[in-house]
């Protein structure tokens, strides 16, 4: 039985050019986290993050993505295309997978203001 | 260059534990993942697991219970032991590693692999 | 588990002409897909990784594509030397499975 819940930032805004982190916490459940991929709106890999064995930043991604803080990932030199969902995909053994879902509007910068909790100056 | 050579006893009894080492050369196995890989006759290629160059190991779940990876840092090798072995682990075992950083899950060396068969 | 089913089991091809191997999952993994070459006699090479990114080394009459569920290892033009054992494996999720590979002879 699957009993933990995914946390996640939720719907945030950053400055095109600027950066931004993502973050998913998984919590009420004692099962072994695995793995954790980060997908596009696309449903394209970003990253993955093994438990073992570390970060894997996608080939495509190299130089717009770092990986961290945590398990969480940082998008840099954002574009208005990187507006959209982002998924946190927590493969755990034994419940299975657990999904977060982040929603990111990058927003010209003449807009300004943007959400600061998860922004990197 | 990367170089990986299995070794150990090609003929295992039934109940008996197998175990397996990879001589690595040309590359320290505290850097990267170093995996056990498998292929009975006939069958897929199965993932049975893996130690990172931490220490730290996983193991598929289906083969969890009998698996134990480990690893020598001052002889550069690690092993396999697989307990209460069946006709059913008869298989090629390959040693290989695994650079996640730039690959992913993506095996870029193996082994030549060495033949294993459980037999009384 | 995810499970990576091959098509076709095997394939006959004249030198010069192209070759296509599929690879289907059972679930979405995204692009978290390697292609190997086994050689008669040896151990399985790299050739793609992500999907299609060529691992160093290998001639570019290799390539990959596809995401989800759906790949596909194309040889633009077959040479002798291409025989052999072609296995898809997924990376998505652990534990990390293989399709039950792909046998390229030459005509």
């Known amino acids: 039985m699957m009993t933990g819940t995914i946390e996640t930032t939720g719907n945030i805004s950053a400055k095109k050019g600027g950066s931004v982190i993502l973050q998913c916490h998984l919590s009420s459940t004692m099962a072994q986290v695995t793995q954790v991929n980060w997908e596009q709106h696309d449903h394209s890999l970003l990253a993955i993050r093994n438990a073992e064995l570390g970060w894997h930043i996608y080939p495509a991604f190299k130089d717009r993505v770092a990986p961290g803080p945590g398990l969480g990932l940082t998008l840099q030199s954002l574009t208005m295309n990187d507006t959209g969902e982002y998924f946190c995909t927590y493969h755990t053994y034994p419940d299975g997978t657990y999904r977060g879902r982040i929603f990111l509007e990058v927003l010209e910068s003449s807009v300004a203001e943007h959400s600061a909790r998860f922004q990197i100056p | 260059e990367v170089q990986l050579q299995e070794s150990g006893p090609g003929l295992v009894k039934p109940s008996e534990t197998l175990s397996l080492t990879c001589a690595v050369s040309?590359?320290?196995?505290?850097?990267?993942?170093w995996n056990w890989i498998r292929q009975p006759p006939g069958k897929k290629l199965e993932w049975i697991g893996y130690?990172?160059?931490?220490?730290?190991?996983y193991y598929n779940p289906s083969l969890k219970s009998r698996v134990t990876i480990s690893r020598d840092t001052s002889k550069n090798q690690f092993s396999l032991k697989l307990s209460s072995v069946t006709a059913a682990d008869t298989a090629v075992y390959y040693c290989?590693?695994?650079?996640?950083?730039?690959?992913?899950?993506?095996?870029?060396?193996w082994g030549q692999g060495t033949t294993v068969t459980v037999s009384s | 588990d995810i499970v990576m089913t091959q098509t076709p089991l095997s394939l006959s091809v004249t030198p010069g002409q192209p070759a296509s191997i599929s690879c289907k999952a059972s679930?979405?993994?995204?692009?978290?897909v390697a292609w190997y070459q086994q050689k008669p006699g040896q151990s399985p090479q790299l050739m793609i990784y992500?999907?299609?990114y060529r691992y160093t080394g290998v001639p570019d009459r290799f390539s990959g594509s596809g995401s989800g569920t759906d790949f596909t290892l194309k040889i633009s033009r077959v040479e002798a030397e291409d025989v052999g054992v072609y296995y898809c494996?997924?990376?998505?999720?652990?534990?990390?499975?293989f399709g039950g590979g792909t046998k390229v002879e030459i005509k």
């Open positions: 290989a590693r695994l650079d996640f950083s730039n690959y992913g899950g993506a095996v870029d060396y």
């Open positions: 040309g590359y320290s196995i505290t850097s990267d993942s």
């Open positions: 130690i990172s160059y931490s220490g730290n190991t």
């Open positions: 679930q979405n993994v995204r692009t978290a």
């Open positions: 992500s999907a299609s």
């Open positions: 494996q997924q990376y998505y999720t652990t534990p990390w499975t």
